[in-house]
C-alpha cells in the first residue's frame, strides 16, 4: 500500500510574501502521529523549509522560529508559508509521514509552483 | 571486531556535512558474500524506531543529535549477526542517499 | 531481482529487472550500486529519478511491480552487485541482488 499526497499545482504569494495551501493525504492506516514537512526544490537542490509533528486530533506545531503554520483538520493541514520573496519562488513539496503507530508510510506531493512577486516600493511623495 | 555469541557490542556512527536531526537515519547490514538487509531506523527527534523481525528485543537503536551520532546497541549476538553494518541516512525523498563505509561485526566462539 | 549474473562486455547495454511481490509505488523504488569492498551508492529513486552525481548512463523505469535499471553502455567501473529497494513503507526491503561481471 502506497499513501498518496494530493497538493495544489501552483500558487501565488500575497504582496505581503504569505502563501497557502492544502496538503491532503489519503491514510493507508489509523495513524496516531503524523509528520508534515515542507521541502523546497530549486533545480536539483532539496532544502527543508519546515516539519512539524502532530497527534492526530491535534493543531500541529511548527517550531518558534519557523516560517510556516499550519493547521490540521482530519487528513488535511492547511499550511502558510510567510516572509517570502520573489527569490523564494520554486517548487514547494508536501511530505507526509505515519510516524506511529506500524507500518511507517512515506507520502510526496507532486509540488505546488509558488510564484513570488516583490511588491514595487511606493513612489516618494512631494 | 570479534565479539563470542551471547554477547554484547556497541555501534557508533558519526555524521558530518548535514542537519543531522532532519534525518532519519538507518543501519542496514550485509552478512558475508549476501545481500543488503535493513536492520533499525530511528526518527528525528529518537522517539521513535523500527526495527527488523531478526533482531526485535535485541538490537536498540538511539542518536544523539547534539553531536550528529548513531548508535546500534546490540545484545544476545548470534553467528548469524556476523555482518558489515553500515549506517545510512534517509534522504528528503526516502532512499538511503548516504553510507558510511561499513563496520564488520563477526560473531564468532 | 534477476537475473542473478549479467555477462556483459564494456560498452554493451546491461538491463536488469526487479520484480515486486506485490504492488508498489513508483516514487519509493530505489536502486543502489555496490563495488566489491564498498558501501552501496544510490543511483536512481522514485524508480526514474537519477541520484546527484550519477551519469546519464544510467537510467530507470516501471510502475506497479515491475521496475527495470538500464546501463545503456557499459564501462569498467559500472561492473558491480546492483539491488533495488522499496522504501515506502516499513520494513525497507531489498531485493537479493545482480551481479553484472566482465564477460
Known amino acids: 500500500k502506497a499513501m498518496h499526497v494530493a497538493q495544489p499545482a501552483v500558487v501565488l504569494a500575497s504582496s505581503r510574501g504569505i502563501a497557502s495551501f492544502v496538503c491532503e493525504y489519503a491514510s493507508p492506516g489509523k495513524a496516531t502521529e503524523v509528520r508534515v514537512t515542507v521541502l523546497r526544490q530549486a533545480d536539483s537542490q532539496v532544502t527543508e523549509v519546515c516539519a512539524a509533528t502532530y497527534m492526530m486530533g491535534n493543531e500541529l506545531t511548527f517550531l518558534d522560529d519557523s516560517i510556516c503554520t499550519g493547521t490540521s483538520s482530519g487528513n488535511q493541514v492547511n499550511l502558510t508559508i510567510q516572509g517570502l520573496r520573489a527569490m523564494d519562488t520554486g517548487l514547494y513539496i508536501c511530505k507526509v509521514e505515519l510516524m506511529y503507530p506500524p507500518p511507517y508510510y512515506l507520502g510526496i506531493g507532486n509540488g505546488t509552483q509558488i510564484y513570488v512577486i516583490d511588491p514595487e516600493p511606493c513612489p516618494d511623495s512631494d | 571486531g570479534v565479539v563470542q555469541p551471547g554477547r554484547s557490542l556497541r555501534l557508533s556512527c558519526v555524521a558530518s556535512?548535514?542537519?543531522?536531526?532532519?534525518?532519519?537515519m538507518h543501519w542496514v547490514r550485509q552478512a558475508p558474500g549476501k545481500g543488503l538487509e535493513w536492520v533499525a531506523v530511528?526518527?528525528?527527534?529518537?522517539?521513535?524506531?523500527y526495527y527488523a523481525d531478526s533482531v526485535k528485543g535485541r538490537f536498540t537503536i538511539s542518536r544523539d543529535n547534539s553531536k550528529n551520532t548513531l548508535f546500534l546497541q546490540m545484545n544476545s549476538l548470534r553467528a548469524e549477526d556476523t555482518a558489515v553494518y553500515y549506517c545510512?541516512?534517509?534522504?528528503?525523498?526516502?532512499?538511503?542517499?548516504?553510507w558510511g563505509q561499513g563496520t564488520l561485526v563477526t560473531v564468532s566462539s | 531481482q534477476s537475473p542473478g549474473t549479467l555477462s556483459l562486455s564494456p560498452g554493451e547495454r546491461a538491463t536488469l529487472s526487479c520484480r515486486a511481490s506485490?504492488?508498489?509505488?513508483?516514487?519509493?523504488l530505489a536502486w543502489y550500486q555496490q563495488r566489491p569492498g564498498q558501501a552501496p551508492r544510490l543511483l536512481i529513486y522514485?524508480?526514474?529519478s537519477r541520484a546527484t552525481g550519477i551519469p546519464d548512463r544510467f537510467s530507470g523505469s516501471g510502475s506497479g511491480t515491475d521496475f527495470t535499471l538500464t546501463i545503456s553502455r557499459l564501462e569498467p567501473e559500472d561492473f558491480a552487485v546492483y539491488y533495488c529497494?522499496?522504501?515506502?513503507?516499513?520494513?525497507?526491503?531489498f531485493g537479493q541482488g545482480t551481479k553484472v561481471e566482465i564477460k
Open positions: 545510512a541516512r534517509g534522504g528528503h525523498f526516502g532512499p538511503f542517499d548516504y
Open positions: 556535512g548535514f542537519t543531522f536531526s532532519s534525518h532519519g
Open positions: 530511528i526518527w528525528y527527534d529518537g522517539r521513535n524506531k
Open positions: 506485490q504492488s508498489i509505488s513508483s516514487s519509493f
Open positions: 522514485g524508480a526514474s
Open positions: 529497494q522499496q522504501y515506502g513503507t516499513s520494513p525497507w526491503t
